[in-house]
C-alpha cells in the first residue's frame, strides 16, 4: 500500500520519477518494462507452447470496460485461463499502453531499444494459490501478464470490438458494456514464440510478483485506430474543469542488470525467400 | 420453454435483509447472464446487478454495491439475491432476466413474473 | 449515469390514433430499446436495438432515433397497446430505464 494517498500519473509532479516516494517498490528490484535486447536473452527449450482456455466469451455476456484514469480495462471472467505455467493463472482484466498522435510509440517493453505503437496486457493471477487478482498481486507467483506489441498496419477487427466502445469510456469513472467476443483474436501469429521473465507491475504499486509473457510477434492495428485510442480519453473526471488527455501512458524500460530473458525460440530469424537470392 | 421463477418475497423489517430465489429452466444455464431488476409502485425500472453462473462473477449497480450480494447455485440453475439494510425505499417487485444478444444488441428477452418485496415495521 | 427522459409520462389517445413516444439520453447512446408493461405483470421485450421488433409484435409498431433522440411510434393505436412503455440503454454503465410513458385509452 502506498505510504499516503493514490495519486499517481506519467507526466508532471506524480509522474513516474516520484512514483517510488508513495510506492517504494517502484525503486525496488525486478521491475518492468525492459528493454528486450540479444545480450540478455536466453533461449530455454523448456518454454512450452502455452494454451488459452475459456478465451472465447460469449456475445451473449456483458464484460465491464473502464476508464480507470490511467487507461481503459476490460474486465475478464475468472475462468479465462492459461494452462502451461507451474500452477493455473485466471485472467483478471486486460489494458493498454499507447503514445500520442505526434509520437505514436508508446509500447512498454521495447525490443532491441524500440518501442511498438502501443502495448497489450492480459492480466491473469495464481488462481491455484489466491482467491482473487488482488489477493495475488503482492505474492510471489502471484501474477501472469500476456503482452501484446501492438505496431501501426492493417485494419484489425479484434481490436475494434474494444475501440468501437471508446466513446462511452471517455472520462475517468466511466464504464460501458462490451458483447463477450474471443480474446484469443487479440494475440499474435506464432504465440509459441515468446520472451520470459520475472518482473513486476509497471503502474504503482509496482509489486515485483509478475511472471512477464512477452509475444515475440507484433499485432497490427491501424492509423484510425490508433489515432482512436490516443485521442478518445482523458485521465479526468467529466466535470474536471482541467480535463487532461490520456496520452504517453507507458513506463520508461527499467533497468536490468544481472538478469536473463528466457526465450521459447531459438533467435535466428529465418531468412526470407529474396534474402536468399 | 424458457422460464424464470422468482420466490422468497415478503413482508420485511427495516433494517433487515431479503435472500430471493431466482431458478431458471429450458435453456442451458451457464450460457447467459442473470440479471435482478427492480420496480418500485408506480415507478420505473432499476438496475441492481448480474452474476455470470459460469463462474460466480457479478458486477452490480454502484448505487447498490455493499448492501446487494448476488450468488448462484449453479447444480440447481438458481440465482440468489440478498440485500441489506432494507429500508422503505427497497419495497419493490424484484424481477429476475435473461439477455440475449441478437444481431448486434442485447435485450432482455425473459422475465420472470417478480416477486414483491414489502420493507416496512 | 446516463439519465433517460420519456415524454410524455402519460398520454390519452383513441383505437386508431397515431402515437409517438420520445426518450432522451442524457449522453450520447448507441441503441435503445423498448419494453411494454401491462399491470401486474413482468415487461416484455417489444423493440430492440432502436428499430428492430421483437418477434410477434405487430408491425404497426416502429422505432427511430439515434445519439440522444429515440422515439417509438405506434401508427395505429389498437385496444391491446394500450399500457405502460420503457426505454432502456445498455451503452453505459448503469445500464438505466425510462421513467415510463403511460398510454391509456381516451
Known amino acids: 500500500a502506498p505510504v499516503n494517498g493514490s495519486k499517481w500519473t506519467y507526466f508532471g509532479p506524480d509522474g513516474e520519477n516520484s512514483w517510488s516516494k508513495k510506492y517504494p517498490s517502484c525503486g525496488g528490484l525486478l521491475q518492468s518494462p525492459i528493454d528486450l535486447h540479444s545480450d540478455i536473452l536466453q533461449y530455454d527449450a523448456s518454454l512450452t507452447p502455452l494454451e488459452f482456455q475459456g478465451y472465447n466469451l460469449s456475445a451473449n455476456k456483458q464484460f465491464l470496460l473502464t476508464n480507470n484514469g490511467h487507461s481503459v480495462k476490460l474486465n475478464l471472467p475468472s475462468d479465462m485461463h492459461i494452462q502451461g505455467l507451474q500452477s493455473r493463472y485466471s485472467a483478471t482484466q486486460l489494458h493498454l499502453h499507447w503514445g500520442n498522435p505526434n509520437d505514436p510509440h508508446g509500447s512498454e517493453h521495447t525490443v532491441s531499444g524500440q518501442h511498438f505503437a502501443a502495448e497489450l496486457h492480459i492480466v491473469h493471477y495464481n488462481s491455484d494459490l489466491y482467491p482473487d487478482a488482488s489477493t495475488a498481486s503482492n505474492k510471489s507467483e502471484g501474477l501472469a501478464v500476456l503482452a501484446v506489441l501492438i505496431e501501426m498496419g492493417s485494419f484489425n477487427p479484434s481490436y475494434d470490438k474494444i475501440f468501437s466502445h471508446l466513446q462511452h469510456v471517455k472520462y475517468k469513472g466511466q464504464e460501458a458494456f462490451v458483447p463477450g467476443f474471443n480474446i484469443e483474436e487479440l494475440l499474435p501469429e506464432r504465440t509459441a514464440e515468446y520472451y520470459r521473465y520475472r518482473g513486476s507491475l509497471t503502474t504503482p504499486p509496482c509489486n515485483p510478483t509478475v511472471l512477464w509473457t512477452v509475444f515475440r510477434n507484433p499485432v497490427q492495428i491501424s492509423q484510425e485506430q490508433l489515432l482512436a485510442l490516443e485521442t478518445a480519453l482523458y485521465c479526468t473526471h467529466m466535470d474536471d474543469p482541467s480535463p487532461r488527455e490520456m496520452i504517453n501512458n507507458f513506463r520508461q524500460v527499467q533497468k536490468f542488470d544481472e538478469r536473463l530473458v528466457y526465450t521459447s525460440f531459438s533467435q535466428v530469424q529465418v531468412c526470407t525467400a529474396a534474402g536468399l537470392s | 420453454e424458457v422460464q424464470l421463477v422468482e420466490s422468497g418475497g415478503g413482508l420485511v423489517q427495516p433494517g433487515g435483509s431479503l435472500r430471493l430465489s431466482c431458478a431458471a429452466s429450458g435453456y442451458s444455464y451457464t450460457d447467459y447472464n442473470i440479471y435482478w431488476v427492480r420496480q418500485a409502485p408506480g415507478k420505473g425500472l432499476e438496475w441492481v446487478g448480474y452474476?455470470?453462473?459460469?463462474?460466480?462473477?457479478?458486477t452490480y449497480n454502484q448505487k447498490f454495491k455493499g448492501r446487494a450480494t448476488i450468488s448462484v447455485d449453479k447444480s440447481k440453475n438458481t440465482a440468489y439475491l440478498q440485500m441489506n439494510s432494507l429500508r422503505a425505499e427497497d419495497t419493490a417487485v424484484y424481477y429476475c432476466?435473461?439477455?440475449?444478444?441478437?444481431?448486434?444488441?442485447?435485450?432482455?428477452?425473459?422475465w420472470g413474473q417478480g416477486t414483491l418485496v414489502t420493507v416496512s415495521s | 449515469d446516463i439519465q433517460m427522459t420519456q415524454s410524455p409520462s402519460s398520454l390519452s389517445a383513441s383505437v386508431g390514433d397515431r402515437v409517438t413516444i420520445t426518450c432522451r439520453a442524457s449522453s450520447s447512446v448507441t441503441y435503445m430499446h423498448w419494453y411494454q408493461q401491462k399491470p401486474g405483470k413482468a415487461p416484455k421485450p417489444w423493440i430492440y436495438?432502436?428499430?428492430q421488433l421483437v418477434s410477434g409484435v405487430p408491425s404497426r409498431f416502429s422505432g427511430s432515433g439515434s445519439g440522444t433522440d429515440f422515439t417509438l411510434t405506434i401508427s395505429s393505436l389498437q385496444p391491446e397497446d394500450f399500457a405502460t412503455y420503457y426505454c432502456q440503454q445498455w451503452s453505459s454503465n448503469p445500464l438505466t430505464f425510462g421513467q415510463g410513458t403511460k398510454v391509456e385509452i381516451k
Open positions: 452474476i455470470d453462473p459460469a463462474n460466480g462473477d457479478t
Open positions: 432476466s435473461r439477455p440475449i444478444y441478437y444481431g448486434a444488441y442485447w435485450y432482455f428477452d425473459v
Open positions: 436495438g432502436t428499430s
